[in-house]
């Protein structure tokens, strides 16, 4: 007996799709060998239709695919737009068609059920609304209009124009008779139930002159859309429930083992704590549609999700829903990066953000997740250089190390910086990731003066002390601007050779400005890095004065409150999804720090590289 297993018989109807799962023992050889779906011919040969190596036969082009799930020992063959010609005997297997491991599958595609002539078919999901159209002749215009449901050989009255309503349809059905001249009446049924499924008969008038029209109502439980996403990546559930529920509370829930549905998030402010920091419910469009984004996907996020509408913000029978089955692929293309980064008060963090390496030209963003109401994510910085005003001098987004990773540096940390941040781009939305910044006890490793006032035309020397553990790191000074941090020449004054006794006090790197000009005023960062991987940074503000003043004065721009017109990652997620960003920075106007002219030698050059660095604290 072959160890490959699958469905022995698959039956469907024309125009439908099938999803055939085949199971195999997940040995390392089996996991990586070729998978195929072939059709057995009269000669006994089995002709490949689709394989895991990318082959798709001409009559399957555009309607079939094969997906391997090596970690599970399964592969899935999806075939759409079935026709009667697809009926036949097939094999799903591993290796070579003629020999190797396989399983026989019989596929039968039929025409679908026979219906009375002229029957109109209405296919609607449970909870939605259907409008059944019933034509009639002029002579029946003044006569009784009615809708019956056929149950076996009998017809049960559902509604009529004399105000009768069958109790099973109470409060969710209406019969509309148009004005004169229109020879059609309609029956509207809201909040469809599975039990509404069946054959209906419209009738106008009575006796031999009556008008009749058959309607076949197919009420479907929404078929879960299969969604496959990578571990650590992001998923977006787009939920369009129709105008009828545009003003009703919306929710996303996850079906549990008891068959109830636990609310993940809703528009009434409820959110499952397991999704803290990594979920947003985007405000609805006028048509009532909305979307939910979940980042930092975990294996335990797998399951069946339903979105729906109900005034209670949770699942209720007979209300519209949409369904997804989420699978999280552990063999992820998204690299591992720390989900928690720790820094000390006054110190810094350097966060590595993954992006799709095929999209090196995409715009990069970093936003702060806020949990209030449905969640939002105001953008703090972007690769075009715009930085939220209150982050001036302490936040920068760098293209390094490149090749699928960018870096965000935040310094002058306070306890208020603790929270969840999202890395994202205007490209592949599945690469959105979440990082939590935690502020822990400790001292910054890099020490710079707190107040620096430079005198115009004179020489200024700013020291930056670093501990012995950074002796092998590259040290640098840079001048911060809202487009980056331009590296400046600096002098490492500590011994550069390997040493036995590390004198903490002698380890310093200095920045010299000679002569000081007006353009030198601003924020300067002292930092350490290894190649293109950034470590800690410390920031110092340099004020420039006309003449020498007794004592020193520290000039610091006051930290601004959050701009009321800040840009926010909310409904804009949709625009990113649709790649239809006119303003790719995600909606609403935004106050930005104006570029302050000459930035000491132009903007920082970025260099592409790869690999990874620990993410941790830094200095002020």
């Amino acid at each position: 007996k072959s160890p490959v297993f699958g469905p022995q018989e698959v039956s469907s109807v024309e125009g439908n799709s099938v999803s055939i799962k085949c199971y195999y023992p997940p040995t390392s050889v089996n996991r990586h060998t070729r998978k195929y779906w072939c059709r057995k011919g009269a000669s006994g040969r089995c002709i490949t239709l689709v394989s895991s190596e990318g082959y798709v036969s001409s009559n399957y082009a555009g309607r079939a695919n094969l997906t391997n799930f090596p970690e599970n020992g399964t592969f899935v063959v999806n075939i759409a737009q079935l026709s009667r010609d697809d009926s036949g005997h097939y094999k799903c297997g591993l290796g070579i068609n003629s020999r190797g491991l396989s399983f026989d599958v019989s596929l039968e595609v039929s025409q679908g059920p026979e219906l009375p002539n002229g029957t109109e078919v209405y296919t609607v999901d449970v909870g939605r609304t259907v409008t059944i159209k019933c034509p009639f002749k002029t002579e029946n215009a003044p006569k009784t209009k009615a809708l019956y449901k056929k149950i076996g050989q009998t017809s049960v009255l559902v509604i009529d124009s004399r105000n009768y309503v069958n109790p099973n349809y109470k409060d969710r059905i209406r019969l509309r008779i148009p004005g004169t001249g229109q020879l059609i009446f309609t029956v509207v049924i809201d909040r469809l139930r599975l039990s509404d499924h069946g054959l209906y008969l419209c009738q106008a008038g009575d006796g031999s002159n009556r008008d009749e029209k058959n309607a076949d109502l197919q009420v479907l439980e929404p078929e879960p859309e299969l969604v496959y996403e990578d571990l650590r990546g992001s998923v977006t559930f787009h939920c369009a429930l129709g105008l009828e529920v545009a003003n009703v509370a919306k929710f996303l829930c996850r079906v549990n083992s008891r068959e109830t549905c636990d609310v993940v998030i809703n528009t009434l402010g409820k959110r499952d704590s397991a999704f803290e920091g990594r979920i947003l419910l985007n405000p609805q469009d006028k048509d009532g549609s909305f979307s939910v984004v979940i980042t930092g996907l975990r294996k335990e996020d797998e399951g069946r999700y339903l979105c729906g509408a109900h005034s209670d913000g949770q699942l209720q029978e007979g209300w519209p829903i949409q369904a997804w089955q989420l699978f999280v692929n552990e063999e992820s293309t998204i690299p591992r990066s720390p989900t928690v980064v720790k820094g000390v008060a006054g110190g810094s963090v350097a966060v590595l953000c993954p992006y799709n390496p095929k999209e090196s030209q995409s715009l990069k963003y970093w936003c702060l997740w806020e949990g209030a109401q449905n969640g939002r994510c105001p953008l703090l910085v972007e690769s075009q250089g715009l930085v939220q005003e209150q982050y001036e001098g302490r936040l920068s987004l760098l293209q390094e190390p490149g090749n699928g990773t960018f870096t965000v540096i935040l310094n002058q940390l306070t306890t208020q910086d603790a929270g969840f941040y999202w890395c994202l781009t205007n490209g592949d939305t599945r690469w959105r990731t979440t990082v939590e910044i935690k502020i822990i006890e400790g001292e910054p490793n890099l020490k710079v003066p707190g107040n620096v006032t430079a005198v115009l035309g004179e020489t200024l020397n700013i020291p930056c002390h670093f501990p012995c553990k950074f002796s092998s790191y590259e040290k640098y000074w840079c001048k911060w601007s809202n487009t980056g941090c331009q590296t400046l020449p600096s002098q490492d004054e500590g011994p550069s050779e390997a040493f036995v006794n590390c004198d903490e006090n002698s380890r310093l790197v200095s920045l010299t400005l000679n002569p000081v000009t007006r353009a030198d005023e601003g924020w300067y960062w002292c930092g350490v890095k290894q190649g293109h991987f950034y470590g800690e940074t410390a920031a110092v503000y340099v004020a420039v004065e006309e003449k020498k003043v007794a004592g020193s004065r520290y000039v610091s721009p006051a930290k601004a409150d959050a701009a009321p017109d800040e840009k926010v990652l909310d409904s804009g997620v949709r625009e990113i999804e649709n790649k239809a960003i006119q303003d790719p920075r995600l909606f609403a106007e935004e106050k930005v720090v104006a570029d302050t002219g000459d930035q000491a030698g132009g903007s920082r050059a970025s260099v592409d590289s790869s690999s990874s660095e620990e993410q941790g604290g830094s200095s002020k």
Epitope: F5, P7, Q8, E9, V10, S11, S12, V13, N16, S17, V18, S19, I20, K21, Y23, F69, E71, N72, G73, T74, V76, G112, L194, L220, E221, E223, P224, V255, S257, E259, E302, G303, R304, E317, Q325, F327
Partner: nanobody, 130 residues
Framework: QVQLVESGGGLVQTGGSLRLSCAAS????????MGWFRQAPGKEREFVAA??????????YVGDSVQGRFTISRDAAGNTVYLQMNSVKPEDTAVYYC?????????????????????WGKGTLVTVSS
Amino acid sequence: QVQLVESGGGLVQTGGSLRLSCAASGRTFSPYAMGWFRQAPGKEREFVAAIRWSGATTYKYVGDSVQGRFTISRDAAGNTVYLQMNSVKPEDTAVYYCAADRVPKDISIDPRNPKDWDYWGKGTLVTVSS
């Protein structure tokens, strides 16, 4: 809560036929898959057959030991599943359990694995006499 009730078990002679039924009921229960397992005294629970559906599409799975002899089907409403047992053998003697699943779960879930089914009936005894 979901209830599964099996019926149709009993005594049958070798080579004979029997038809088991399993009815699902409970709050808004419309299963996604239903199946049959069996357990002979002192043995592990064994997969017999399963049927899974999605709209107008149906998938039928049959265990190796009953292939060609047993067939699985369901009623139009999808709440009752049948196991048609033909050409029965003494080794088919066992308690037959109905199983059901409301949710299409992870791609790795194998219908042959009892752990992957959410709901179970109490069982019906089938005895095949020689």
